[in-house]
């Protein structure tokens, strides 16, 4: 026997309290399969959360961040603040890389400049709070009275950072 | 959409070595750190340490620094785990997961069993 | 490193509040975040960054932190609440993260 429920479209709920009659889906609410015994609750884009696409009757709406902020999860289920380049997000806030560490992106965390010295190369770039250094060739492989531009980086072991 | 997805279950030997996978898709695999967090039988959840792919830099767990290797090769866009000598104790579930602070996506998780 | 210790075992009764506490030297300078893992299944992140709830996780759950203590709160638990919860914070000394050694909560 087939089951009455399984004639109501995406968009409609079988009814229950009205003899299994393929009901709507009230407002703020949607079904996104047939067959369903309940509309499921719209989920609402609010605070850090802003609507990207509004809930239908047969699709729920869909969320991303506010400016200044990404987005993390499944959906889009989180939202946490962007810093700028050159620095990482503590509870105090978004906090400049201390020295000898970079961050190239608006999210995460510093992270030590790579040590040239370790590949047997020397610093071709200097590193700076927002960049990696640029290792280029070894000593060695510099012309006679040559040298790098800089002292090696630091090794590549995380220092002290700000809270 | 992102997923993280682990290599299969491993039955071992103390002793042997062991690399195990998590493949990341869905996103920039290279711009967000990859944790690896243990979880030994009836247990709870330990964090071992990180990659930053883009790099391959890693940060360690004290508890974990010597004991395990985590390394990464962006261009498959895949995490490693390894063991150069495995021992009785490294019996656990292993799970892989995005972030460094959050951990927002895992992996369905590697039953490593060490056994003689 | 920061230790985080939490009780191993909370029970409640359907549709009473559960406090699940997360212990740790000045974690409040830090942020909190609670996962819930259900046997056999990775754990998922019910609160995030002290307070803030990701979509999808019901209303009941919420959370604070502040001083040596982080608290999750289940208000109205659920049967299917039942499950062990994580706390973890990211030390910025050391740059590692921590788990608390867990909470398995019953509902009773």
């Known amino acids: 026997l087939q089951d009455p429920c399984s004639k109501c479209p995406a968009g409609t709920f079988c009814d229950n309290n009205r003899n299994q009659i393929c009901s709507p889906c009230p407002p703020n609410s949607f079904s996104s399969t047939s067959g369903q015994k309940a509309c499921d609750i719209c989920r609402q884009c609010e605070g850090v959360f802003r609507t990207k696409k509004v809930c239908s009757s047969t699709s729920n709406a869909e969320c991303d961040c506010t400016p200044g902020f990404h987005c993390l999860g499944a959906g889009c289920s989180m939202c946490e603040q962007d810093c700028k380049q050159g620095q990482e997000l503590t509870k105090k806030g978004c906090k400049d890389c201390c020295f000898g560490t970079f961050n190239d992106q608006k999210r995460g965390i510093c992270r030590p400049w790579t040590n040239c010295s370790l590949d047997g190369k020397s610093v071709l770039v200097n590193g700076t709070k927002e960049r990696d250094v640029v290792c280029g060739p070894s000593p060695a492989d510099l012309s006679p009275g040559a040298s790098s531009v800089t002292p090696p980086a630091p090794a590549r072991e995380p220092g002290h950072s700000p809270q | 959409q992102v997923q993280l997805v682990q290599s299969g279950a491993e039955v071992k030997k103390p002793g042997e070595s062991l690399k195990i996978s998590c493949k990341g898709s869905g996103y920039s695999f290279s711009t967000y750190w990859i944790s690896w967090v243990r979880q030994m039988p009836g247990k709870g959840l330990e964090w071992m340490g990180k990659?930053?792919?883009?790099?391959?830099?890693?940060n360690y767990s004290p508890s974990f620094q010597g004991q395990v290797t985590i390394s990464a090769d962006k261009s498959i866009s895949t995490a490693y785990l390894q063991w150069s000598s495995l021992k009785a104790s490294d019996t656990a579930m292993y799970y892989c997961?995005?972030?460094?602070?959050?951990?927002?996506?895992w992996g369905q998780g590697t039953l490593v069993t060490v056994s003689s | 490193d920061i230790e985080l210790t939490q009780p191993p075992s909370v029970s409640v009764a359907p549709g009473q509040t559960a406090r699940i506490s997360c212990s740790g030297d000045n974690i409040g300078d830090q942020y909190a975040h609670w996962y819930q893992q259900k046997p056999g299944q990775a754990p998922v992140v019910v609160i995030y960054?002290?307070?803030n709830r990701p979509s999808g996780i019901p209303e009941r759950f919420s959370g604070s932190n502040s001083g040596n203590t982080a608290t999750l709160t289940i208000s109205g638990t659920q049967a299917e609440d039942e499950a062990d919860y994580y706390c973890s914070t990211y030390t910025f000394v050391g740059f590692t993260t921590v788990f608390g050694g867990g909470t398995k909560l019953t509902v009773l």
């Open positions: 997961a995005r972030g460094y602070g959050i951990f927002d996506y």
């Open positions: 960054q002290d307070k």
């Open positions: 990659i930053y792919p883009g790099d391959s830099y890693t």
